[in-house]
């Protein structure tokens, strides 16, 4: 006569997080008397998942009616699977006794849990940088399983190649995290640009997750200054303008100096926006020529976004 066999037909089972996992197990005989128990893992540290004889296992239900007279199906369903449930599950037949003794084990079923990655979070540098500088962006996503994942970087739809990616941990784990750093060279036209981190994973059914960063939060475009003298408005007055062009962000303070002495300070308010997202602003100064005996040096000094001031001067000729 053949001795009882414990049959676990599935070597592996893969389940999405949140779903139920069905682990199949049948025995070939009702002999000997004694319960079936399910364990996760093997050896002394194995974890009891279900005991036919006793105990309360709220997440576990038997697929067949375990009290049915000729039941030889001891498959179980585990509800609300999380990555922490991953492992190898063994269906084990025990022989009635005091205590029950292990009689025969199934070969085991490896349960792998498919868990979606979290939405990628993209973060840029703490301080703004100017065009032609290289800045680093990081992208992080967590809690996914299995480990295989693809991450891509884009700037305005163009794929970037200068990045480094790590998936942690390196060894076996219930879930994984990805961390990537991309290098981006800024240009003056990047105010409206976006950097996108795209994560593709088996759980996403071909619909990757994206995280974005707006370069408007990273870039600083310093202004160009041009000081010009306008035609004489009145006999003793000259109108001098300071054109502040192509700057970003808007935070800007302008100071007029006459021969090195502060004449007026103002903050950029009514600016015009260029197509590329930068701003233009113009300030003018009415100079009373009759108040000056000598030539006047007019300086337009601009402090942009807390940076050291830049200036442009204009010499105003005073005719005797």
């Amino acid at each position: 006569e053949e001795e009882l066999q414990v049959i676990q037909p599935d070597k592996s089972v893969s389940v999405a997080a949140g779903e139920s996992a069905i682990l199949h197990c049948t025995v070939t005989s009702l002999i000997p008397v004694g319960p079936i128990q399910w364990f996760r893992g093997a050896g002394p540290a194995r974890e009891l998942i279900y005991n036919q004889k006793e105990g309360h296992f709220p997440r576990v239900t038997t697929v067949s009616e375990s009290t049915k007279r000729e039941n030889m199906d001891f498959s179980i369903s585990i509800s609300n699977i999380t990555p922490a449930d991953a492992g190898t599950y063994y269906c084990v037949k025990f022989r009635k006794g005091s205590p029950d003794t292990e009689f025969k084990s199934g070969a085991g079923t490896e349960l792998s849990v498919r868990a979606k990655p979290s939405a990628p979070v993209v973060s840029g540098p703490a301080a703004r940088a100017t065009p032609q500088h290289t800045v680093s962006f990081t992208c992080e996503s967590h809690g996914f399983s299995p480990r295989d994942i693809t991450l891509k970087w884009f700037k305005n739809g163009n794929e970037l190649s200068d990045f480094q990616t790590n998936v942690d941990p390196v060894g076996e784990s219930v879930s994984y995290s990805i961390h990537s750093t991309a290098k981006v060279v800024l240009t003056r036209e990047d105010v409206h640009s976006q950097v996108i981190c795209e994560v593709a994973h088996v759980t996403l059914q071909g619909d990757p997750l994206r995280g974005t960063a707006n370069l408007s939060e990273t870039i600083r475009v310093p202004p160009t200054l041009e000081v010009t003298q306008q035609p004489v408005r009145a006999e003793n007055q000259v109108n001098v303008t300071c054109q502040v062009r192509k700057f970003y962000p808007q935070r800007l303070q302008l100071t007029w100096l006459e021969n090195g002495n502060v004449s007026r300070t103002e903050t950029a308010s009514t600016v015009t926006e260029n197509k590329d997202g930068t701003y233009n602003w113009m300030s003018w100064l009415l100079v009373n020529v009759s108040a000056h005996r000598d030539d006047v040096k007019l300086t337009c000094q601009v402090e942009h976004d807390g940076q050291p001031a830049v200036s442009k001067s204009h010499d105003l000729k005073v005719s005797a």
Epitope: E1, E3, S29, L30, I31, P32, V33, K53, K96, S98
Partner: antibody
């Protein structure tokens, strides 16, 4: 599905007897067969259960004198050193107890131990 | 070894009566539920009614029910029928494979 016993009869004290239990409609391969006896006018008494190979077990009073065995279609109970108090109707039943209760029973065979 | 005590040893009842039979084990049965009930009529083999303390066997009328756990068990016949007059035995299993013991039986007689 049924079980049919045979082999009962009159035997002298100290004698031996082998009872048979033939199954029809199902195989005994995956089931235990238990033997239960009932002395005249008395209650039921579990004798032992025959599983597979080494998996056989008996009531403490039956150990050493009673031995069970089975094939896929027939179970046997070999009884030795019989005594007057072994006189009873012997039933075979399919099952091993707990979640494998005795659900099919034979009609019983009478064993009389007397000189 | 486990010992099983049934009470009463006999009970007289009428058709339609609710009848309750009890079975007490000297120690907790295996798994707290290794308890079966059998019905036997004169000249016949026993018949399985209930197993695992409360599971109704196939083909058994629903007027039979079992309850209990550990050491104390009950067989209830909700409305006694003429064919229910018989002797009822409980079979309890201890923690050892070779520890299966029948109670002494309760005879249900016509009043």
């Amino acid at each position: 599905r049924q079980l049919v016993e045979s082999g009962g009869g009159l035997v002298q004290p100290g004698g031996s007897l082998r009872l048979s239990c033939a199954a029809s409609g199902f195989s005994l391969s995956s089931h235990g067969i238990s033997w239960v006896r009932q002395a005249p006018g008395k209650g039921l008494e579990w004798v032992g259960t025959i599983g597979t190979g080494v998996i056989t077990y008996y009531a403490s009073w039956a150990k050493g004198r009673f031995t069970g065995s089975k094939t896929s279609s027939t179970a046997y109970l070999q009884m030795t050193s019989l005594r007057a108090e072994d006189t009873a109707v012997y039933y075979c039943a399919r099952g091993s107890a707990w979640n494998d209760p005795f659900d099919y029973w034979g009609q019983g065979t009478l064993v009389t131990v007397s000189s | 070894d486990i010992e099983m005590t049934q009470s009463p040893s006999s009970v007289s009842a009428s058709v339609g009566d609710r009848v309750t039979l009890t079975c007490q084990a000297s120690q907790s049965v295996y798994g707290n539920n290794d308890l079966a009930w059998y019905q036997q009529k004169p000249g016949q083999a026993p018949k399985l009614l209930i197993y695992l303390a409360s599971t109704l066997a196939t083909g058994v009328p629903s007027r039979f029910s079992g309850s209990g756990s550990g050491t104390d068990f009950t067989l209830t016949i909700s409305s006694l029928q003429p064919e229910d007059f018989a002797t009822y035995y409980c079979l309890g299993g201890g923690d050892d494979e070779a520890d299966n013991v029948f109670g002494g039986g309760t005879k249900v007689e016509i009043k």
